[in-house]
């Protein structure tokens, strides 16, 4: 089947990095500068991606593969193939429309990206809070109150400071 296809369609012989040039009797012509073809038998070459602004070039475009971008310092990639660059925030913050905002009480973010998430609810596993949570760190759960020896004690987190809707641990 492959042989009959190549007899019928001379373009199928054009390798990656070339295109089948209809204007030149279906000759395999090399991709022009700033374009590529990653598979054989293509009738056109694709324009190389350009990494501009907050994007920087991670891998240069070649005749057979597209350029790859990442983000300049202070930004990180989002989406397939780094289609967007999103601003970094500090630990203990999350990105909103207005920029980086501190995590609300009862939530934390230990990374420079992503959203603030709630402290672990220790009581779900029958445990108690050993170390209180902060904006940057989750709570540390310890043994359940029943497991503690008479002299030991566990830390109880402060009551939510009027932050709406937080379910205290």
């Amino acid at each position: 089947f492959e042989r009959t296809r190549s007899l019928q369609d001379p373009c199928s012989n054009c390798p990656a990095g070339t295109f089948c040039d209809n204007n030149r009797n279906q000759i395999c012509s090399p991709c022009p500068p700033n374009s590529f073809s990653s598979a054989g038998g293509q009738r056109t070459c694709d324009i190389c991606r350009q990494c501009k602004g907050v994007f920087r070039t991670r891998k240069e475009c070649s005749s057979t593969s597209n350029a790859e971008c990442d983000c300049t310092p202070g930004f990180h990639c989002l989406g397939a193939g780094c289609s967007m660059c999103e601003q970094d925030c500090k630990q203990g913050q999350e990105l909103t429309k207005k920029g980086c905002k501190d995590c609300c009480f009862g939530t934390f973010n230990d990374q420079k990206r992503g959203i603030c998430r709630p402290w672990t609810n220790c009581s779900l596993d029958g445990k108690s809070v050993l170390v209180n949570g902060t904006k940057e760190r989750d709570v540390v759960c310890g043994p359940s109150p029943a497991d503690l020896s008479p002299g030991a004690s566990s830390v109880t987190p402060p009551a939510p400071a009027r932050e709406p809707g937080h379910s205290p641990q």
Epitope: T96, G106, C116, G165
Partner: antibody, heavy 121, light 111 residues
Amino acid sequence: QVQLQQSGAELAKPGTSVKLSCKASGYTFTSYYIYWVKQRPGQGLEWIGNIWPGNGGTFYGEKFMGKATFTADTSSSTAYMLLGSLTPEDSAYYFCARRPDYSGDDYFDYWGQGVLVTVSS
Amino acid sequence: QVVLTQPKSVSTSLKSTVKLSCKLNSGNIGSYYVHWYQQHAGRSPTTMIYRDDKRPDGVPDRFSGSIDSSSNSAFLTINNVQTEDDAIYFCHSYDSTITPVFGGGTKLTVL
């Protein structure tokens, strides 16, 4: 592809409880908030609360504290909402929805199909 | 407490342009993103506009979103209105990043 599949309609008597489920597929369940939203027939949308399945941390709207309880089973990628002490006021559609991990004020990108809870004696 | 106010109902004619409003009662409309959902009867909401003015894949470019800080409002504009646009439209924003707020919804009737 991402899907949120909710359990079937519920008919309950006043004073009883119902447990609604929301089974997630097509993404990492522990890395996104699941929100629960109430809609009475012909009315608007009302935030009940949300859960971070990764650690079971929860938030509740003031109106729903003591009414709703959220849990999540990571082994089956399912979020649950228990509605207690039911009254006719709890008769509504209940939706679960996912919020992307993009920004703190982001939209709900996927919704469950909704489940109708009817409270009647 | 943050409230988003939408007109209860709006009527428009086929192929016309309609602009639905969502007014924030306190604070600044620019503080948090505004999102718009469409809901047909008996269905779950679907996103029409997110992050003020972005359109998800598959949503016709007849739909657009905007913010007007002078009126402290967000707007959903639908050009060349079609019969399938007959639905309820909800706006959605935040009071704090853990407290989402919805508008009451606008029932759009296409005549």
